[in-house]
């Protein structure tokens, strides 16, 4: 067990032209607050999966009123850390979403109004017990500077908070086979206590209270040999006469998912799909409130009016469901004409038109350039019974109506992932890099740069520590 801690240093306009307007005004004073969502592993930041490692909301910041004519400065921040407790082992790799919210304090009917100012996301490697890691992320014209760390709660220690420490019983040394607990040299690593009754021959544990089975054994205490009906023969399991083989237990055997969650094997672990009202790596956490950050995709959480409804999520356009977890399928209305393929990009609908058709909804039949205008300064080029637009710089598409994809030039360095955004682009950096374009290597503790990529990866692909 332990706590993930996030310290916001500043939130304000990023460098470069196009500074954002201040979110507050004399007529509408406002204050900021932040939400952090953590997921284990390097999962999809924007996916509709829950914040399985946990989530937290900050306190509200000081009230801020814009000075007329002044550019937007760094905005006043809430005091204190955002803390996300975790019950299980710290996974070492995690994904985060940090959202900056504005609370308007004008004369709104029905209380204050909230709106999402910016969202940043990333994937990081982090050992528990290490120093604060610093990061800079940009969302449109805004820039967020923050630090984070994971620390274990005593008696847990180690990079995953899975080792336990106890005060030494003797002044000089630890017991047989037990190491001193760095950095707490006056304490000793405690032996793991497995689940009571766990077979000493066929079971083992990596965390207190668990019982994991060696290959060929199963059951809650690893006392049941794995077999299948086809393996029952006079010569027992693995009989050469039947050719029967005995695979070891899988990670979903015995269903590690609590509270009715369903288990799926993943390439190296397992994944729990939790029923409503439960979350966590094993669906072990219940009693969700707004403090748990249950609303996804920028949904705003409001405390429920009755005890049976702890919270209500107000979803942004394009999302629905009790937790704003479902993307509205706007393509089901078949808005694209003439056989066009509909793509719901979240922020917009896009129609991919069949050859010979164009327009936002493929409504234009393209015969030739006669009467056909190319938008945004493009020029029409005829050929082959169809027409084509040669577009001005910064525009694309059949009729030059689309802004060129800001991600097309692959602006994110060092394997960062580019996400198109209404105000530009956002880079989600590969582990070990930071900055608006992932251009800065992160060297915590003065460590050297990341090692070379493993075979099969090109430079610029996401790298891993081996």
């Amino acid at each position: 067990a332990g706590v993930f801690e996030l310290q916001i240093h500043s939130f304000g306009p990023g460098p470069g032209p196009g500074a954002p307007r201040s979110p507050c005004s004399a007529r509408l004073p406002c204050r900021l607050f932040f939400r952090v969502c953590l997921k284990p592993g390097l999962s999809e930041e924007a996916a509709e999966s829950p914040c399985a490692l946990g989530a937290a909301l900050s306190a509200r910041g000081p009230v801020y009123t814009e000075q007329p004519g002044a550019p937007a400065p760094d905005l006043p921040l809430p005091d204190g850390l955002l803390q996300v407790p975790f019950r299980d082992a710290w996974p070492g790799t995690f994904s985060f979403i940090i959202e900056t919210w504005r609370e308007e304090l004008g004369d709104q009917i029905g209380g204050p109004a909230w709106s999402l100012l910016a969202r940043v996301a990333g994937r990081r490697r982090l050992a528990a017990g290490g120093p604060w890691a610093r990061d800079i992320q940009r969302a449109g014209a805004w820039e967020l500077r923050f630090s984070y760390r994971a620390r274990c709660e005593p008696p847990a220690v180690g990079t995953a908070c899975t080792r336990l420490c106890r005060p030494r019983s003797a002044p000089s040394r630890c017991g047989p086979g037990l190491r001193p607990c760095a950095p707490l040299e006056d304490e000793c690593e405690a032996p793991l206590v497995c689940r009571a009754g766990c077979s000493p021959e066929h079971g083992f544990c990596e965390q207190p209270g668990e019982c994991r089975c060696l290959e060929g054994w199963t059951g809650p205490l690893c006392t049941v040999p794995v077999s299948t009906s086809s393996c029952l023969s006079p010569r027992g399991p693995s009989s050469a006469t039947t050719g029967c083989l005995v695979p070891g237990p899988g990670p979903c055997d015995g269903n590690p998912c609590a509270n009715g969650g369903s288990c799926s094997e993943t390439p190296r672990s397992f994944e729990c799909t939790c029923p409503r009202g439960f979350y966590g790596l094993r669906c072990e956490v219940s009693g969700v409130t707004c403090a748990d950050g249950p609303c996804f995709n920028g949904g705003l959480c409001v405390g429920g009016a009755d005890p049976d409804s702890a919270y209500i999520c107000h979803c942004p356009p394009g999302f629905q469901g009790s937790n704003c977890e479902k993307r509205v399928d706007r393509c089901s209305l078949q808005p694209c004409r003439n056989g066009g393929l509909c793509l719901d990009l979240g922020h917009a609908l896009r129609c991919r038109c069949r050859a010979g058709f164009a327009g936002p909804r493929c409504e234009h039949d393209l015969d030739d350039c006669a009467g056909r205008a190319c938008a945004n300064g493009g020029t029409c080029v005829e050929g082959g019974g169809a027409h084509r637009c040669s577009c001005a710089l910064g525009f694309g598409g059949r009729d030059c109506r689309e802004r060129a994809d800001p991600c097309a030039a692959r602006p994110c360095a060092h394997g960062g992932r580019c996400y198109a955004h209404f105000s530009g682009l956002v880079c989600a950096c590969a582990p070990g890099y930071m900055g608006a374009r992932c251009e800065f290597p992160v060297h915590p503790d003065g460590a050297s740069a990341l090692p070379a990529a493993p075979p099969g990866l090109r430079p610029g692909d996401p790298q891993r520590y081996l």
């Epitope: 994937r123 390439p267 996401p462 891993r464």
Partner: antibody, heavy 123, light 108 residues
Framework: QVTLKESGPGILQPSQTLSLTCSFS??????????VGWIRQPSGKGLEWLAH???????RYNPALKSRLTISKDTSSSQVFLKIASVDTADTATYYC???????????????WGQGTSVTVSS | QIVLTQSPAIMSVSLGERVTMTCTAS???????LHWYQQKPGSSPKLWIY???NLASGVPARFSGSGSGTSYFFTISSMEAEDAATYYC?????????FGAGTKLKIR
């Protein structure tokens, strides 16, 4: 340079056990993040994942075939083995082994494949 | 299990034409674990696009991939003769790890 090569019996009879070997070079299964998987493809059909094994001996099997499959490795000789018990004609296919890389949990990909070995089950 | 449905099963295109094929999953797949492979007759599959949109080493820039959740797309901006092959999508998210039935791309 990463290479993988599959070998097997070529032809065997129903109810026998099929033993396949994948010999590889250019990487090591003692290296964190490396694995080897088996995939098969009946002639003119699609691909079916069978099993894989990781550097730390974590194994996964296709649930539909789990009771008949065993995957193992010999790290020192850079080989991975797959046994399929009680074969029948439906197991006739080209069997491929492939290297899997775990890129920090960010993704897992079968990034290098062997040339495949043809296996026919016939009485 | 997650069933991956590829469409169309076969497509014939002219050289220089834009090509788009689709892979639809029966339940949501993380985009990190959705890959595309190219296979030519008599050869083994080759990793072509990994994690939805990243080109494997040596793959020409005319190829691209996109998508999320249950819908994924594979695109060739301008078809060339060497692109004729069968393309498989593959999810390495939840066991059993499955492949689509493939889209066979032919030159018209």
């Amino acid at each position: 340079q990463v290479t993988l090569k599959e070998s097997g019996p070529g032809i065997l009879q129903p109810s026998q056990t099929l033993s396949l070997t994948c010999s590889f070079s250019g990487f090591s299964l003692s290296t964190s993040g490396m694995g080897v998987g088996w995939i098969r493809q009946p002639s003119g059909k699609g691909l079916e994942w069978l099993a894989h094994i990781w550097w730390d001996d974590v194994k996964r099997y296709n649930p539909a075939l789990k009771s008949r499959l065993t995957i193992s490795k010999d790290t020192s000789s850079s080989q991975v083995f797959l046994k399929i018990a009680s074969v029948d004609t439906a197991d006739t296919a080209t069997y491929y082994c492939a290297r899997i890389a775990d890129y920090g949990g960010d993704y897992y990909a079968m990034d290098y494949w062997g040339q495949g070995t043809s296996v026919t089950v016939s009485s | 299990q997650i069933v991956l449905t590829q469409s169309p099963a076969i497509m014939s295109v002219s050289l220089g034409e834009r090509v788009t094929m689709t892979c639809t999953a029966s339940s949501s797949v993380s985009s990190s674990y959705l890959h595309w492979y190219q296979q030519k007759p008599g050869s083994s599959p080759k990793l072509w696009i990994y994690s939805t949109s990243n080109l494997a080493s040596g793959v020409p820039a005319r190829f691209s991939g996109s998508g999320s959740g249950t819908s994924y797309f594979f695109t060739i901006s301008s078809m060339e003769a060497e692109d004729a092959a069968t393309y498989y999508c593959h999810q390495y998210h939840r066991s059993p790890f499955t492949f689509g039935a493939g889209t066979k791309l032919k030159i018209r």
